[in-house]
């Protein structure tokens, strides 16, 4: 059976939107008015992995692009990147672990924990215009809480 996917945008707890700031980079900043159409649209696929009531394994692709968020070690540190894939083979139900995030819902907020690196989360900085990254702390300076907005296909 084909993998189930939905299209959405994400905003962090400060209401910053995510935009493509480079061919393989996302950043977070406040957008308003017509600039809102610049925000990245994700294709969130529901994939194989450990699942519970409040924890759902997903992959986060960029709609209309052969790019997925993935978690890899760089200089011995878990790092978030946009990775190019062969569109003939993706998305798929059994995604490689580096592409998988545990979508955790707490109090109407979402966290995205790396399946490859437990306790590391998709994060944004308090500061404007900074890269989206993989952070190893929750509840600190960096923001790990997001809201999801559905986008019609």
């Amino acid at each position: 059976a084909p993998v189930r996917s939905l299209h959405c945008t994400l905003r962090d707890a400060q209401l910053k939107s995510l935009v493509m700031s480079g061919p393989y980079e996302l950043k977070a900043l406040h957008l308003q008015g017509q600039d809102l159409e610049q925000q990245v649209v994700f294709s969130m696929s529901f994939v194989q992995g450990e699942e519970s009531n409040d924890k759902i394994p997903v992959a986060l692709g960029l709609k209309a692009k052969n790019l997925y968020l993935s978690c890899v070690l760089k200089d011995d540190k878990p790092t978030l990147q946009l990775e190019s894939v062969d569109p003939k083979n993706y998305p798929k139900k059994k995604m490689e672990k580096r592409f998988v995030f545990n979508k955790i819902e707490i109090n109407n907020k979402l966290e995205f924990e790396s399946a490859q690196f437990p306790n590391w989360y998709i994060s944004t900085s308090q500061a404007e215009n900074m890269p989206v990254f993989l952070g190893g702390t929750r509840g600190g300076q960096d923001i790990t809480d997001f809201t999801m907005q559905f986008v019609s296909s």
Epitope: V19, M20, S21, G22, P23, E25, K27, L29, L31, D35, E37, Q38, V40, V41, L62, K63, A64, K65, N66, S84, P87, N129, P131, V151
Partner: antibody, heavy 120, light 110 residues
């Protein structure tokens, strides 16, 4: 109102260098990626590359090396540096704003263009 | 390396004619296609984005269709101001690309 104006074109000798500027207003270069496109006399549109909102550049495969795209967000200006100019670089050079609508890159609006003529 | 192939390179037509221009991508680009109109000595103007969405202020006689690799721009009833050159552009990838534009189609008066 969104506006883009290119400048810096003119007559240059083969082997010379040139820096074109694109002054923008009505939007932020921190939000929008920008592109340069050129058009040789009587020919089609040829994409040169992007300067992304984060500051990195992407180039057409043929443009890597001699062409450099940069920006100064504080001056609301994007630049195109061309080195080792050749006769075949003679063209109108356009800058345009890149709108990322559902992740799809669309060029709107465009500047009026600036003509570069390479001749001895 | 995505390549864009436009056809025909030129078309002769009369006012009131229906004109169709095709654009083919060498690989799947979803709905990631835009169309531009350019008149001699002028800057290009966005007509259609995301394959079928009309840009602001563009007359409804222009329409776009297609998805994947094959796309079409249609002018339902050609007007005198529509004689121009039309370009397609893929907006999905900027990596290892020669040109994001098709070669252009010149619409001339018959």
């Amino acid at each position: 109102e969104v506006q883009l104006v290119e400048s810096g074109g003119g007559l240059v000798q083969p082997g010379g260098s040139l820096r074109l500027s694109c002054a923008v207003s009505g939007f932020s270069l921190d939000v929008y990626t920008m592109t340069w496109v050129r058009q040789a006399p009587g020919k089609g549109l040829e994409w040169i590359g992007y300067i992304w909102s984060g500051g990195s550049a992407s180039y057409a495969s043929w443009a890597k090396g001699r062409f450099t795209i940069s920006k100064d967000s504080s001056k609301n200006t994007v630049y195109l540096q061309i080195n080792s100019l050749r006769a075949e670089d003679t063209a109108v050079y356009f800058c345009a704003r890149v709108k990322m609508i559902s992740n799809i890159e669309t060029f709107d609006p465009w500047g009026p263009g600036t003509l570069v003529t390479v001749s001895s | 390396d995505i390549q864009m192939t436009q056809s025909p390179s030129s078309v002769s037509a009369s006012v009131g004619d229906r004109v169709t221009i095709k654009c083919q991508a060498s690989e799947r680009i979803y709905s990631g296609l835009a169309w531009y109109q350019q008149k001699p000595g002028k800057r290009p103007k966005l007509l259609i984005y995301r394959a079928s969405t009309l840009a602001s202020g563009v007359p409804s006689r222009f329409s776009g269709s297609g998805s994947g690799t094959d796309f079409t721009l249609t002018i339902s009833s050609l007007q005198p101001e529509d004689f121009a050159t039309y370009y397609c552009q893929q907006g999905v990838s900027s990596s290892d690309i020669d040109n994001v534009f098709g070669g252009g189609t010149k619409v001339e008066i018959k």
